[in-house]
Interface confidence: low
């Protein structure tokens, strides 16, 4: 029999049918069964940890501590869940080079035979920019298309107004500097940047997940939290109200609490099988 659930890994999760819990005959889901945001499902005598993250397709690459690049942070967390091992974000942007695999004391890089990751010239490309390594000089290319993004005016940290978060992201990428959403609506001095320009600014912000979310937060006079509040909401979206000093959390379905840290058992999911009810 397997010694732990990690021995039951399958490409989509863990199928632990046949796992022998000698005390109960059945292995039960509890808070420790699935780590790294995996959801525990028990169907009959089968316990499965499922990593069904609803990752969007935003290209906001991050470099993981395992040396792998991910399309965005959500995919990194999904990988951590599937592997049942911690993967930390090393840096924004794709990993510069492949790192040795293995486990060691590196927080931000794979730590195998190579003692450290070499820094390539592409490390200077940040804020969503991609590096064209074939160029004679270092070129940071911003392949960001805001043409399909809804109109949702915002004031950015450079004091300029933009038609939407995508344009802020694009501008930040072009200028290779951090520009963030400061407030909803146009800036008071009404300086506006509406199209791609040399002067444009776009931030690798997690606020730009999609226009609908921003519109929704706009209706409630919330702005997305600064990047520094990553982790403030365990299972939900961090929002900052202009009227409040502390941010608040808009919890995902099935979670509650100040930081969306508690399971909301008012949301019941019935799992078929011999067990009467199963909260997942």
């Amino acid at each position: 029999f397997p010694t732990s659930l990690s021995d039951c890994q399958t490409p989509t999760g863990w199928n632990c049918s046949g796992y022998d819990d000698r005390e109960n005959d059945l292995f039960l889901c509890d808070t420790n069964t699935c780590k790294f945001d995996g959801e525990c499902l028990r169907i009959g005598d089968t316990v499965t940890c499922v990593c069904q993250f609803k990752c969007n397709n935003d290209y906001v690459p991050v470099c993981g501590s395992n040396g792998e690049s991910y399309q965005n942070e959500c995919y990194l967390r999904q990988a951590a869940c599937k592997q049942q091992s911690e993967i930390l974000v090393v840096s924004e942007g794709s990993c510069a080079t492949d790192a040795g695999s293995g486990s060691g004391d590196g927080v931000h890089e794979g730590s195998g035979e190579t003692s450290q990751k070499e820094t390539s010239t592409c490390d200077i490309c940040q804020f969503g920019a991609e590096c064209d390594e074939d160029a004679e000089d270092v070129w940071c290319v911003c392949n960001i298309d805001c043409s399909q993004t809804n109109f949702n005016p915002l004031c950015a940290s450079d004091g300029k107004s933009y038609d939407n978060a995508c344009q802020i992201k694009e501008a930040s990428c072009q200028k290779q500097e951090k520009i963030e959403v400061m407030s909803l609506g146009r800036c008071q001095d009404n300086t506006t940047t509406t199209t791609k320009s040399e002067d444009g600014h776009y931030a690798r912000t997690d606020y730009a997940e999609n226009a609908n979310k921003l519109e929704e937060s706009a209706r409630e006079h919330h702005i997305p939290c600064p990047e520094h509040y990553n982790g403030f909401c365990m299972h939900g979206k961090c929002e900052h109200s202009i009227n409040m000093q502390e941010p608040s959390c808009r919890c995902d379905a099935g979670y509650t609490g100040q930081h969306c840290e508690k399971k909301d058992y008012s949301v019941l999911y019935v799992v078929p099988g011999p067990v009467r009810f199963q909260y997942v």
Epitope: V89, V107, K117, G257, H259, E261
Partner: antibody
């Protein structure tokens, strides 16, 4: 607002165990972040000692690994430092601090610090 | 362990001056560097994280730059409250380590 407060004896005898408590208010230590202990000998620099993460896992400075233990009491929202077999070299101001998640371990909230003197 | 070296242990400066404090890592730490200010008898306060990001509430006169092994903290115009100790910290690999500190004194 998040606040951290260290407490514990200010004087410890050599070879004994130093025990400190960090009480956290304004944020649940199980909800996120990494909860560190850092010390600063008088007139010197800072030394990171170790942390306990929101999920209860630990990481320690290898220079202290055989002597250090960081635990927590989630019901009281506190975490603790134990340092065994202390010597005069362990005399320092001890700080607890909150470190960020997801690849950023800078420490955004610190306690005010407590001076621990090791002397007989 | 990664050594973080702040070559200047102290610097004399005046209110209004532009000041640059440097920190050198013994190996590549990407951008996993933070800067702290510590006033006498007080705990350190986070100024900059991820090498160049200002922490919430930190005045815009503070800026950080660098990647790889060389990092700088710049104070564009010294204010009276800025005379203090400044520490860099790397969190690229365990154990996390701090620089020895740079004391900014009144000239």
């Amino acid at each position: 607002d998040v606040q951290l407060q260290e407490s514990g004896p200010g004087l410890v005898k050599p070879s004994e165990t130093l025990s400190l408590t960090c009480a956290v208010t304004g944020y649940s230590i199980t909800s996120g972040y990494y909860w560190s202990w850092i010390r600063q000998p008088p007139g010197k620099g800072l030394e990171w000692m170790g942390f306990i993460s929101y999920d209860g896992s630990n990481k320690y400075n290898p220079s202290l690994k055989n002597r250090i233990s960081i635990t927590r009491d989630t019901s009281e929202n506190q975490f603790f430092l134990k340092l065994s077999s202390v010597t005069a070299a362990d005399t320092a101001v001890y700080y607890c601090a909150r470190g960020l998640r997801r690849g950023d371990y800078s420490m955004d909230y610190w306690g005010q610090g407590t001076l621990v003197t090791v002397s007989s | 362990d990664i050594q973080m070296t702040q070559s200047q242990s102290s610097m004399s400066t005046s209110v209004g001056d532009r000041v640059t404090i440097t920190c050198k890592a013994s190996q590549n730490v990407v951008t996993a560097v933070a800067w702290y200010r510590q006033k006498p008898g007080k705990s350190p306060k986070l100024l900059i994280y991820s090498a160049s990001n200002r922490h919430t509430g930190v005045p815009s006169r503070f800026s950080g730059s660098g990647s790889g092994t060389d990092f700088t903290l710049t104070i564009s115009s010294m204010q009276p409250e800025d005379f203090a100790d400044y520490f860099c910290q790397q969190y690229s690999s365990y154990p996390f380590t701090f620089g020895g500190g740079t004391k900014l004194e009144i000239k």
